[in-house]
């Protein structure tokens, strides 16, 4: 049994890290493998993750790591029974992938402006709470080429756009994702999308 692609891990920097790897051939991850993880600290528990399959040869493990701080460093040991397949380490603060924003809502009754709001997925006492900025993707449900990204470089989880910038009488969808520049994070997954009908009417022009 051989590891083809070594485990790579990302952390949501609140309670969970996710590690993925690939084996040399088809593997029943939960039956054959265990990922053992331990905080590098004088006395700390050695916790264990039962991996799940991610494709025929791919495995994924979710590691519980609450109360994360910047100095935290974990040792990782991948076992097949009593055989150690791979040994490595993981520092959550250096591999941050934020949680996806939540509760995306579109308000269409604000004069000629669309107001999009969402909630920061972190509690105020978390390090990432004030570090997140966002990207909002809006697209036409019937026309995949009619898609745009709005960068929200401020921390307020809102976006205002003129309804007139979108086609009238068309259903649109929006989704939002987050990243933390100061942590050199990757982008979060997209939030679930929300749908609305753009009923904006062009004002009648008099000649």
């Amino acid at each position: 049994m051989k590891v083809l692609q070594e485990p790579t891990c990302v952390s949501d920097y609140i309670s969970l890290s996710t590690c993925e790897w690939k084996m040399g051939g088809p593997t029943n991850c939960s039956a054959e493998l265990r990922l053992v993880y331990q905080l590098v600290f004088l006395i700390s528990e050695t916790n264990m993750c039962v991996p799940e399959n991610n494709g025929a040869a791919g495995c994924v493990c979710h590691l519980f790591m609450e109360d994360m701080v910047g100095a935290d460093n974990y040792t990782l040991d991948l076992w097949a029974g009593q055989q150690l397949l791979w040994k490595g380490s993981f520092k959550p603060s250096e591999h941050v992938k934020p949680k996806a924003p939540e509760n995306l809502t579109v308000y269409t009754n604000v004069s000629e402006t669309l107001l999009l709001t969402w909630s920061n997925p972190y509690p105020p006492d978390n390090y990432l709470y004030e570090k997140l900025t966002y990207a909002v993707n809006i697209w036409n449900e019937n026309d995949p080429t009619d898609s745009r990204i709005y960068d929200v470089t401020y921390q307020e989880p809102t976006l205002r756009i003129a309804a007139s910038t979108l086609k009238s009488g068309v259903s649109y969808r929006a989704r939002v994702r987050a990243w933390a520049q100061s942590y050199n994070s990757t982008w979060s997954e997209w939030s679930p999308s929300t749908k609305w009908y753009n009923a904006y009417k062009e004002p009648f022009e008099k000649h």
Partner: antibody
Framework: ESQLVESGGGLVQPGGSLRLSCAAS?????????MCWVRQAPGKGLEWIAC?????????YYASWAKGRFTISKDNSKNTVYLQMNSLRAEDTAVYFC????????????????????WGQGTLVTVSS | IQMTQSPSSLSASVGDRVTITCQAS??????LAWYQQKPGKPPKLLIY???TLAYGVPSRFSGSGSGTDFTLTISSLQPEDFATYYC???????????FGTGTKVTVLG
């Protein structure tokens, strides 16, 4: 230094109730581990009672014999775990230990305790009339 | 899950090799730990994950086994090793933790 200190033990009459406390110091009681209770009757072996996950999800596990009469809970703000014991019987007489436990998890919803790494000194509960 | 530990007691001399066994009633993979307990004290973790030595535990202690059969070995018994030893099996199917009945190691003679 990490340590656990139990309190709340003492003499109680059959049918009575008692709440034991376990104060954690030197580590955060809300971090990724389980907090558990184990007991030992005089001159007898060790018997696991219950565990509660110390982090946000707070999932609990009980020995089959303890369900209904015993309840484990926590207060993360006080770094304390509790064991509420009701309808006590003479056979519940024992030293009650608090212990911190490692865990195994599968996915994000299935997580269970699997060994006790750090123990308190114990508190004696005597059930007698 | 039931954990059957044997022997329930044994007498040995300093320097002896001592073996204690624990049998689980179902497959518990490597979810087994070993503890040492002295009178009036809480148990002390010796071995976890069937064969991993806990922090600060002397290397004369070792554990082996997986599935249903497990062994704790003390390669050369020292005066401070006279105590009671317990195994602990964990079943992830039920989330339960069951201790063995214990093995009391006493001085021969």
């Amino acid at each position: 230094e990490s340590q656990l200190v139990e309190s709340g033990g003492g003499l109680v009459q059959p049918g009575g109730s008692l709440r034991l406390s376990c104060a954690a110091s030197g580590f955060s009681s809300s971090s990724a581990h389980y907090m558990c209770w184990v007991r030992q009757a005089p001159g007898k072996g060790l018997e696991w009672i219950a565990c509660i996950y110390a982090g946000s999800r707070g999932s609990t596990y009980y020995a089959s014999w303890a369900k209904g009469r015993f309840t484990i809970s926590k207060d993360n703000s006080k770094n304390t775990v509790y064991l509420q014991m009701n309808s006590l019987r003479a056979e519940d007489t024992a030293v009650y230990f608090c212990a911190r436990a490692a865990f195994v998890n599968r996915g994000v919803s299935w997580i269970w305790p699997y060994y006790f790494s750090l123990w308190g000194q114990g508190t004696l509960v005597t059930v007698s009339s | 899950i039931q954990m059957t530990q044997s022997p329930s007691s044994l007498s040995a001399s300093v320097g002896d090799r001592v073996t204690i066994t624990c049998q689980a009633s179902e497959d518990i993979e490597s979810y087994l730990a070993w503890y040492q307990q002295k009178p009036g004290k809480p148990p002390k973790l010796l071995i976890y994950r069937a064969s991993t030595l806990a922090y600060g535990v002397p290397s004369r202690f070792s554990g082996s086994g997986s599935g249903t059969d497990f062994t704790l070995t003390i390669s050369s018994l020292q005066p401070e090793d006279f105590a009671t030893y317990y195994c602990l099996g964990s079943s992830y199917s039920t989330g339960s933790n069951i201790f063995g009945t214990g093995t009391k190691v006493t001085v021969l003679g």
